[in-house]
Amino acid sequence: QFPRQCATVEALRSGMCCPDLSPVSGPGTDRCGSSSGRGRCEAVTADSRPHSPQYPHDGRDDREVWPLRFFNRTCHCNGNFSGHNCGTCRPGWRGAACDQRVLIVRRNLLDLSKEEKNHFVRALDMAKRTTHPLFVIATRRSEEILGPDGNTPQFENISIYNYFVWTHYYSVKKTFLGVGQESFGEVDFSHEGPAFLTWHRYHLLRLEKDMQEMLQEPSFSLPYWNFATGKNVCDICTDDLMGSRSNFDSTLISPNSVFSQWRVVCDSLEDYDTLGTLCNSTEDGPIRRNPAGNVARPMVQRLPEPQDVAQCLEVGLFDTPPFYSNSTNSFRNTVEGYSDPTGKYDPAVRSLHNLAHLFLNGTGGQTHLSPNDPIFVLLHTFTDAVFDEWLRRYNADISTFPLENAPIGHNRQYNMVPFWPPVTNTEMFVTAPDNLGYTYEIQWPSREFSVPE
């Protein structure tokens, strides 16, 4: 959402979020690190191209032309400098002058040593319990953001991990149309469209950076869960990793796992949609998880096959009209899991990413809640690994990522909601090792061709 320094009456009224870096001569004297040439305060660039007609409520949602409903000036950083005040480096760079390349390795969770597994679990738990040092979340829409008295900004602190959950919730929430009116649900700024992969890529990158900074461990990396096993068991659902099944309630996590103590945020949908409030930092009930337990839907009781990944990587077009969840021959829609692994759209199909979520059969299978289950992180790092392999194979061909007429939030140059500072889909449509400072340690299955008899 927004830096704590910008959650003020003055910043919100002025529309300027350009915090100081080192204001030696007093407040406002080093906006965006301008005194050291790191950046400057400039007008926000927001995508104004048309979106598809399935969203008919222009002017009613704070997420439109993000982030202009809140701020119209932000820091534009020079060179490899980055961040809300140009005080950090772009992904893949480090050092005081952001001139040292860095490459971290994301590895299979199951391949980590016992120590590394334990370190990762403890780091996640620390992120759940550590207040985000930079960002605060809005608990009201823009028209109510200054509170009933017009002088009390409606923002809250939130933990690093819950911020990760909140940003996802905010991107998928319904459009509130007013008290007594039904909220509009045919909108999603991070799923069912071309931005699915780029949005989730930045989402992970932000969490990874936040955890690196929390630990002050620049080489910390998020591992992945290779969910394409074809099995009907969750191989990472053990107490030393993501938590086994509770013996007392098959939908809960074992009390021997730290994750059994986690409580979810953003679960009060009824309130958000009828009162127009936003999810806040209040924690609620436990994570629910019942892998392979949905007996009513046998198709989601088994994880994707290894060959499903090999097949989806042969779909050479990134996306295809209508750039939605019914696109056919679209790599994005295939890996997202609305098409079968060969790219053919079928409304009955749930494959790859979607199937992995639904297999978890609980918190992780509900879009507005899913990041509350930390398996979400591992599921999406694997999805991102598939995306990065596609980018490598097809030379990051962005030509079929639409500039306009995608679902709202999904145009190529749209600033991904609700990330700050503004970051476009294009910026994430690049090969990670060369451009974003991370790589995957992974072997891809080669497609097996069966000879017809």
Partner: antibody
């Protein structure tokens, strides 16, 4: 280039306190955690823990809780180690080392500060 | 907690000879092992990281090998300035560092 300059040797009586400093230069102090390592005379190296120089949050190794305090002053890019209720067995060289290039090893070290506790 | 055991405790060799120092971990540390050299009155100096990578400015006569639980530091041809104490190190849980007890390399 990265440099860590520690304060000079200290001679203290049992029960007293000591505060040693480690001034960093050549990098952004608040970007990298600072570790503290102890080496008793003729002995090996022992990790005492580290301080997050961004948040000030310290993490202590087993055996280094209670009398040992890590702190810092970001305005002068300096980390501090304070030891209270000194005992003879605290006699050692204390090193600071930032977690700079990687979290897996320590590639820059201060020159060390000898603390001698003797009556 | 992982324990690192170095052997031998003392190694007596002459300049020009080959030195082989061993470090054994009580359980696998993958390839996350480093070697340091410490001379009297000086701070430790990083020689090798990730089991086999030479740190900046370290001469080619120093090499590291091994993975899992068994690691070796080799000095192909000893120079007079190489006589010192050598420590192996791994990063234990929660960003703490564990060191071996050291091997003293002395002139024969």
């Amino acid at each position: 280039q990265v440099q860590l300059v520690q304060s000079g040797s200290e001679l203290k009586k049992p029960g007293a306190s000591v505060k040693i400093s480690c001034k960093a230069s050549g990098y952004t102090f608040t970007s990298y955690a600072m570790n503290w390592v102890r080496q008793a005379p003729g002995q090996g190296l022992e990790c005492m823990g580290w301080i997050n120089t961004n948040t000030g949050n310290p993490t202590y190794a087993q055996g280094f809780t209670g009398r040992f305090v890590f702190s810092m002053d970001t305005s002068v890019s300096t980390a501090y180690l304070q030891i209270s209720s000194l005992k003879a067995e605290d006699t050692a060289i204390y090193y600071c080392a930032p977690r700079y290039s990687s979290s897996w090893y320590l590639d820059y070290w201060g020159q060390g500060t000898l603390v001698t506790v003797s009556s | 907690e992982i324990v690192l055991t170095q052997s031998p405790a003392t190694l007596s060799l002459s300049p020009g000879e080959r030195a082989t120092l061993s470090c054994r971990a009580s359980q696998s540390v993958s390839s996350y092992l480093a070697w340091y050299q410490q001379k009297p009155g000086q701070a430790p100096r990083l020689l090798i990281y990730d089991a086999s990578n030479r740190a900046t400015g370290i001469p080619a006569r120093f090499s590291g090998s091994g993975s899992g639980t068994d690691f070796t530091l080799t000095i192909s041809s000893l120079e007079p300035e190489d006589f010192a104490v050598y420590y192996c190190q791994q990063r234990s849980n929660w960003l703490m560092y564990t060191f071996g007890q050291g091997t003293k390399l002395e002139i024969k």
